[in-house]
Interface confidence: low
């Protein structure tokens, strides 16, 4: 069919709650493209009717909610004027036994986020919620071992749970919960987070090393397209998140409306002792407001930035 397969993504998900996956692959999805979702190589596209339990919402596929029978491989086809790319997403649906102690509390599935708090420090946990604009998320509640978290040491700030003076007792099974509203109906979104405690400064005893960028400036002409890679080496068993931020906000969130600046899909190369990760940032069109602003690559506790600057005028042309 002439479409190029880009990659396969595996997701293990909880039944009975919403799930969304966004078909983005900068810079391919940045231009004039059409995005269509299919299930299990079906020739019939996923419905775009918002009342459908499973439907396409712009570039997203949205499940309201996931059900057992939704397991399978979904394809997202990105068609440009002269190109066709396909992303495969393998979804596996499980029933989670959230609070049934006889089953052992939160299950250790791969859709759970493993996060680390640093002993004696002020630290935070993050609730990762990714849904299209049609979904309105209410305030986030946090639970530990199925009890709502309360107390002076804990503060909820947007999608984060701030924990002051982390103690050994803070390890355990957490969950963040939000009520999602879509077309007047409400659903529960629940993410399990397994939290461990470390005394070391780095994550898992190793601080990720950002090879590039190196806190430097890049000369770039106004109006041009720019792609910058963030290259990170880290241990094979690391649980660090790698991302690009501006003004302490994920670039995909900061430029949510215009989508002018986007974070790419992370890739990695495996070596014997470590992994080399790459996640890029794409500026579809550099604007004046981008100059002088630090664009930060984050990898666990490590950060490095680039600053765009206008090239010095070339007086030889005169």
């Amino acid at each position: 069919d002439g479409c190029k397969d880009i990659f396969m993504k595996n997701e293990i998900l909880s039944a009975s709650q919403p799930f969304a996956f966004n078909c983005t692959f900068p810079p391919i999805t940045s231009g004039e493209v059409s995005v269509t979702w299919y299930k299990n190589s079906s020739k019939i596209p996923v419905s775009k009717i918002i009342q459908s339990r499973i439907h396409q919402d712009e570039t997203w596929i949205l499940f309201l909610p996931m059900e057992w029978g939704d397991s399978g491989v979904y394809q997202c086809v990105i068609k440009g004027r002269d190109s066709c790319h396909r992303i495969h997403v393998n979804l596996t649906v499980f029933e989670k036994h959230w609070c049934d102690t006889s089953i052992g509390g939160l299950p250790n599935l791969s859709d759970e986020y493993k996060q680390i708090l640093h002993l004696g420090k002020d630290d935070s946990l993050t609730c990762h919620l990714h849904f299209p604009k049609s979904c309105v998320l209410g305030p986030i509640k946090w639970y530990k071992d199925c009890n709502e978290i309360k107390g002076e040491r804990f503060t909820v700030l947007e999608t984060r749970l701030l924990v002051s003076n982390v103690s050994a007792e803070d390890r355990g099974n957490y969950a963040c919960q939000a009520i999602l509203t879509h077309s007047g109906k409400q659903y529960e979104v629940l993410n399990g987070i397994t939290v461990s405690i470390t005394e070391r400064a780095g994550y898992g005893g190793s601080v990720p090393k950002i090879i590039y960028p190196k806190n430097h400036s890049i000369e770039v002409q106004l109006g041009t397209t720019l792609i910058v890679d963030c290259n990170v080496t880290d241990t094979k068993d690391n649980t660090n998140l790698r991302c690009w931020r501006v003004n302490n906000t994920l670039v995909d969130d900061y430029y949510d409306e215009s989508k002018r600046i986007r974070e790419g899909v992370e890739t990695h190369v495996s070596f014997r002792e470590h992994n080399l990760y790459t996640v890029n940032i794409t500026f579809l069109e550099v604007k004046m407001e981008d100059y002088g602003l630090p664009f930060m690559c984050h990898a666990g506790v490590s950060t490095a930035y680039i600053i765009l600057q206008l090239p010095a005028p070339d007086f030889r042309a005169y």
Partner: nanobody
Framework: DVQLVESGGGLVQPGGSLRLSCAAS????????LGWYRQAPGKQREAVAT????????YYSDSVKGRFTISQDNAKTTVYLQMNSLRAEDTAVYYC?????????????????????SGQGTLVTVSS
């Protein structure tokens, strides 16, 4: 709109049995937590029994453990409360409720009532 309709209440002698049913309509999705709470005249409401949306987790208050059983039909749109060995102190209006959160404390017998929808109630009277 979501509606919860209870049935099966009535007058029963001590030691007798009743089966309450709650039919949920208007759902386009499976609720996370269905269950029953009761309120006797002049008393605090009490979570009696709850079942998670998948039917995988149940909760019973200490006062009904071993006597009451909560269950769902296969379509998960009706929830039942089988009440055996009824006592005078079980006399109350029984309400069906549907909660959005499987982690809501109500789902596990907590005192905060985080259910989203509630029915009109059905009266259960245990008397000789």
């Amino acid at each position: 709109d979501v509606q919860l309709v209870e049935s099966g209440g009535g007058l029963v002698q001590p030691g007798g049995s009743l089966r309450l049913s709650c039919a949920a309509s208007g759902y386009s999705y499976r609720t996370q937590c269905l269950g029953w709470y009761r309120q006797a005249p002049g008393k605090q409401r009490e979570a009696v029994a709850t079942i998670s949306g998948g039917g995988t987790s149940t909760y019973y208050s200490d006062s009904v453990k071993g006597r009451f059983t909560i269950s769902q039909d296969n379509a998960k749109t009706t929830v039942y409360l089988q009440m055996n060995s009824l006592r005078a102190e079980d006399t109350a209006v029984y309400y069906c409720a549907a909660g959005l959160s499987v982690l809501g404390s109500w789902c596990h017998g907590g005192s905060s009532y985080e259910y989203t929808y509630s029915g009109q109630g059905t009266l259960v009277t245990v008397s000789s």
